[in-house]
């Protein structure tokens, strides 16, 4: 029995990490690294905060929560199987050996391939780079990501597709949004 955080290939993974600031806005540095927490610092740092802000991050890694309130949970965007493993969240509390260290296990599973309705298949074939999954946890919701390299005619066509397709209903029911740009 062990706590593990799960995501499918292509989804966003979520790794929780929390601490209680001594006072609101009284932040301590935090680092996230790939691999178990070493004696000091984080190995293979992917993100770091200081007393004020996020001061270092690498692509695909970001903080989604309100880190000023102590929510320093990590989101890893568009995961691959290679993202599996142990991650270290380290709360760097001033003083000797005061750090709080958390080793969190991330398990990435291959994406489930589910047969889609014909209409949806046509839609994704026309705009193959549009559909992505965002969020975390077992109850995933579908969200339309950004629309790079699509001109106004295509957007108009897309709007018509959405208006009369079953996908529109599916998306509306799941609270999905379309972001353009």
């Amino acid at each position: 029995s062990e706590v593990e955080y799960r995501a499918e290939v292509g989804q966003n993974a979520y790794l929780p990490c929390f601490y209680t600031p001594a006072a609101p806005g009284n932040l301590v540095p935090v680092c996230w690294g790939k691999g178990a927490c070493p004696v000091f610092e984080c190995g293979n740092v992917v993100l770091r905060t200081d007393e004020r802000d996020v001061n270092y991050w690498t692509s695909r890694y970001w903080l989604n929560g309100d880190f000023r309130k102590g929510d320093v949970s990590l989101t890893i965007e568009n995961v691959t199987l290679a993202d599996s493993g142990i991650y270290c969240c380290r709360i760097q509390i001033p003083g000797i050996m005061n750090d709080e260290k958390f080793n969190l296990k991330l398990v990435i599973k291959p994406a489930k391939v589910t047969p889609a309705p014909t209409r949806q298949r046509d839609f994704t074939a026309a705009f193959p780079r549009m559909l992505t999954t965002r969020g975390h946890g077992p109850a995933e919701t579908q969200t339309l990501g950004s629309l790079p390299d699509i001109n106004l005619t295509q957007i108009s066509t897309l709007a018509n597709e959405l208006r009369d397709s079953r996908l529109a209903n599916d998306l509306r029911d799941s609270g999905a949004t379309i972001r353009i740009g």
Epitope: Y5, F18, M97, P138
Partner: antibody, heavy 116, light 107 residues
Framework: QVQLQQPGAEFVKPGASVKLSCKAS????????MHWMKQRPGRGLEWIGR????????KYNEKFKNKATLTVDKPSSTAYMQLSSLTSEESAVYYC?????????WGTGTTVTVSS | DIVMTQSHKFMSTSVGNRVSITCKVS??????VAWYQQKPGQSPKLLIY???YRYTGVPDRFAGSGSGTDFTFTISSVQAEDLAVYYC?????????FGSGTNLEIK
């Protein structure tokens, strides 16, 4: 198999102290924090505090700061909670539980009865 | 301290029914809520953590959802063995706090 073993019961007199134990097995003891909870009938669950078995660092609920002291013995993979100056208010079931912010494995619980 | 409010102290349902238990939090805790099941005479057991993650070995009839201040725990098809008290817990800030519990009775 991961287990946290606690004595079933402790009987103590008012004003005395008691030291409760929680023996961990089936995992690396220093890998996860150990928390302590109090449960009284009709009062739900209260978080007393936690200890990091690796560093010995502790954090307490203010409400229990002068009542509970958390320690560990790494060689025996055992966590301890000492409760001092006991009154009838401390009659309850006390659980140890592991992990960081929530509790994936709970001990069997120790029923503490404070009575003269 | 963060207050966790489980408005229903008791809930009664029949085997096979769907039941939802709610937990309201006094301040925004992101998705930092766990749910536990405590059967009579037993220690609590972790079912859901970080609002929606099922713990290893927990049947998929148990589910959690919510974020911010409103959280829901659902049993999609109640079984006789689900008779228990269910607690929510916030794991956002210390002191960690629990709801007062919802006692699920099976008719």
């Amino acid at each position: 198999q991961v287990q946290l073993q606690q004595p079933g019961a402790e009987f103590v007199k008012p004003g005395a102290s008691v030291k409760l134990s929680c023996k961990a097995s089936g995992y690396t003891f220093t890998s996860y924090w150990m928390h302590w909870m109090k449960q009284r009938p009709g009062r739900g669950l209260e978080w007393i505090g936690r200890i990091d078995p690796d560093s010995g660092g502790t954090k307490y609920n203010e409400k229990f700061k002068n009542k509970a002291t958390l320690t560990v013995d790494k060689p025996s993979s055992t966590a301890y909670m000492q409760l001092s100056s006991l009154t009838s208010e401390e009659s309850a079931v006390y659980y140890c539980a592991r992990y960081y912010w929530f509790f994936d494995i709970w001990g069997t619980g120790t029923t503490v009865t404070v009575s003269s | 301290d963060i207050v966790m409010t489980q408005s229903h102290k008791f809930m009664s349902t029949s085997v096979g029914n769907r039941v939802s238990i709610t937990c309201k939090v006094s301040q925004d805790v992101s998705t930092a809520v766990a749910w536990y099941q405590q059967k009579p005479g037993q220690s609590p057991k972790l079912l859901i953590y970080s609002a929606s993650y099922r713990y290893t070995g927990v049947p998929d009839r148990f589910a959690g959802s919510g974020s911010g201040t409103d959280f829901t725990f659902t049993i999609s098809s109640v079984q006789a063995e689900d008779l228990a008290v269910y607690y929510c817990q916030q794991h956002f800030n210390t002191p960690f706090t629990f709801g007062s519990g919802t006692n699920l009775e099976i008719k």
